[in-house]
């Protein structure tokens, strides 16, 4: 019997489910009942799932695998594996007995993204030519084990004083951190790049080293005092300008934008060419309005995970440069409020008000008051919990001895947008419900 | 800019026990990978442990077992609690936030940890 397989790995990204495909061609007349269908790992021959006696056995691999029914008298044996883990990787045979057998073993390669690498600089303050300096470059919770790679701004390989340590953890993915120590040139670009083989996922981060200080007759850069504020998922415009000089092309000018604190680099323009983003693909410059000496950098799409200080460096034949700061902000929903016990309420009784305001950003002041204005500030309880984008779900507890009647309102401030957002609920004299019944 | 600040570091006999601390400034502290590394005196930083935002755990081989990285995201801190302490353990150790999403990171100034008899 011949029992077809592909001939290359499957590939799976951890946390998703896969199809290892097995088939055989089925004879004329063939039924369920004739068919012995066993997958198994290859090497241990464990079993992993089966279909005899004309009926799905079910799995026997951590409840995780399925076969597809509906297929199975046409040949078709594949085996569905779900929410696939690290140790799934290896090789599984599909064995088909029904008159004749015949087995194929397919291989399954697991993998798994890694992150943006960050960036870190040691010294980090005060920087010259001639300066011995760490570059730590770390990288998380990818699979299989990374290839790391160091090269300088032009994309020679930096091969040097190089060390590269992977970790893994209980699931079985690696953390990366790799540590170059390199002595500064005059300035220029270091990149990490983290390389995960299997995916051929390339994650690279670089920082850049500019001068710090700058000859009389600085290039005079200016930027907004305050900061940017910009609402999560909208552009921001970070202002930068400086003055060009009679006769000034803009092959003469050198612009870098990097984050303030690790110098990573965010975008630039050198030898007279925009080189493009270097900060998830959402930055631009303002190409036209280069040549007046506007600077900008438009930053779209704005995350939570955005917000800090943003160089402008400008190059002509002198420097110099100005930070300006991005302040994100996400405005939080109309609060929820409940109430319990939430029925048959009297004067005299305790209640627990709770008032649930969501994904906003960044965390929020939240007060308590009563009709008249008056703050609630005895028995509360507020929690803020913050997601993966970095909002914040914010829940704050008020537990109150009822008056005769009374009206309890929460009011959840974002700080920096002074958006109020509030709630009420009103507690009437007679024994009530809430929320009020139709 | 997020600052660490290390504490909890001094002098162990061998067997022994102690545990670092590292506060963090900011709100979003649970969005960063903490990690522990720590360099021994004429030695290049090595990393000992992990702690993911997602609640992972990563560790160094020569620390299994022996070491257990842990955080609390409400006060902004990730500990690390060292027992069965050897010699070869001696190093300062040194916090360090990644951000989870933007490749941020940063360096605490370290503290100092002295295994000897």
């Known amino acids: 019997l011949e029992v077809q397989v592909p001939e290359d790995p499957v590939v799976a990204l951890v946390g998703t489910d896969a199809t290892l495909c097995c088939s055989f061609s089925p004879e004329p007349g063939f039924s369920l009942a004739q068919l012995n269908l066993i997958w198994q790992l290859t090497d241990t021959k464990q079993l992993v799932h089966s279909f005899a006696e004309g009926q799905d056995q079910g799995s026997a691999y951590a409840n995780r695998t399925a076969l597809f029914p509906d297929l199975l008298a046409q040949g078709n044996a594949s085996l569905r594996l779900q929410r696939v883990r690290v140790a799934d990787e290896g090789s599984f045979t599909c064995f088909v007995s029904i008159r004749d057998f015949g087995s194929a073993a397919v291989s399954l390669q697991v993998a798994a993204p890694y992150s943006k690498p960050s960036m870190t600089l040691e010294p980090n303050k005060d920087l010259r030519p001639g300066d011995t300096v760490t570059i730590t470059c770390s990288s998380y919770q990818g699979y299989p084990e990374a290839e790391v790679f160091w090269q300088d701004g032009q994309g020679v390989p930096l091969t040097g004083n190089v060390t590269t340590s992977q970790m893994a953890n209980e699931q079985g993915l690696f953390d990366v951190h790799s540590i170059l120590r390199v002595v500064l040139g005059a300035n220029g670009t270091y990149s990490c790049l983290v390389r995960n083989p299997v995916l051929q996922q390339d994650a690279h981060s670089s920082v850049t080293i500019t001068p710090q200080r700058s000859p009389t007759g600085a290039v005079e850069v200016q930027v907004p005092e305050d900061p940017v504020v910009a609402l999560v998922g909208t552009d921001a415009t970070l202002r930068c300008s400086f003055s060009p000089e009679p006769g000034f092309s803009l092959a003469q000018l050198n612009l870098i934008w990097q984050l303030t604190d690790t110098k990573q680099l965010v975008h630039s323009f050198t030898e007279g060419r925009d080189q493009g983003s270097a900060y998830a693909n959402r930055t631009a410059l303002f190409p036209d309005l280069l040549a007046q000496g506007n600077a900008s950098l438009r930053l779209q799409r704005v995350r939570v995970a955005d917000e800090g200080s943003f160089t402008c460096f400008v190059s002509i034949r002198d420097f110099g440069s100005a930070a300006v700061s991005l302040q994100v902000a996400a405005p939080y929903s109309k609060p929820s409020m409940t109430l319990e016990p939430n029925k048959d309420l009297r004067p005299g009784d305790t209640v627990t008000i709770t008032c649930s305001s969501y994904r906003g950003y960044p965390e929020a002041e939240v007060f308590w008051q009563d009709g008249q204005g008056v703050p609630l500030t005895g028995n509360v309880t507020t929690s803020q919990m913050a997601n993966e984008q970095g909002l914040f779900d914010v829940h704050s507890v008020l537990r109150v001895v009822l008056g005769a009647n009374g009206t309890y309102s929460c009011l959840v401030r974002n700080p920096v947008l002074q958006q109020d957002a509030h709630g009420s609920v009103t507690i009437t004299g007679q024994p009530m419900t809430f929320p009020p019944e139709a | 800019e997020v600052q660490l600040v290390e504490s909890g570091g001094g002098e162990v006999q061998p067997g022994g026990s102690l545990r670092l601390s590292c506060a963090a400034s900011?709100?979003?502290?649970?969005?960063?990978?903490m990690s522990w590394f720590r360099q021994a005196p004429g030695k290049q930083r090595e990393p000992v442990a992990t702690?993911?935002?997602?609640?992972?755990?990563n560790y160094a081989e020569s620390v299994k077992g022996r070491f257990t990285i842990s955080r609390d995201n409400a006060k902004n801190t990730v500990y690390l609690q060292m027992n069965s302490l050897r010699a070869e353990d001696t190093a300062v150790y040194y916090c360090?936030?990644?951000?989870?999403?933007?490749?941020?990171?940063?360096w605490g100034q370290g503290t100092l940890v002295t295994v000897k008899p």
């Open positions: 360090k936030a990644d951000h989870g999403y933007n490749g941020r990171g940063y």
């Open positions: 900011g709100s979003t502290f649970s969005m960063y990978h």
């Open positions: 702690s993911h935002h997602g609640g992972t755990t």
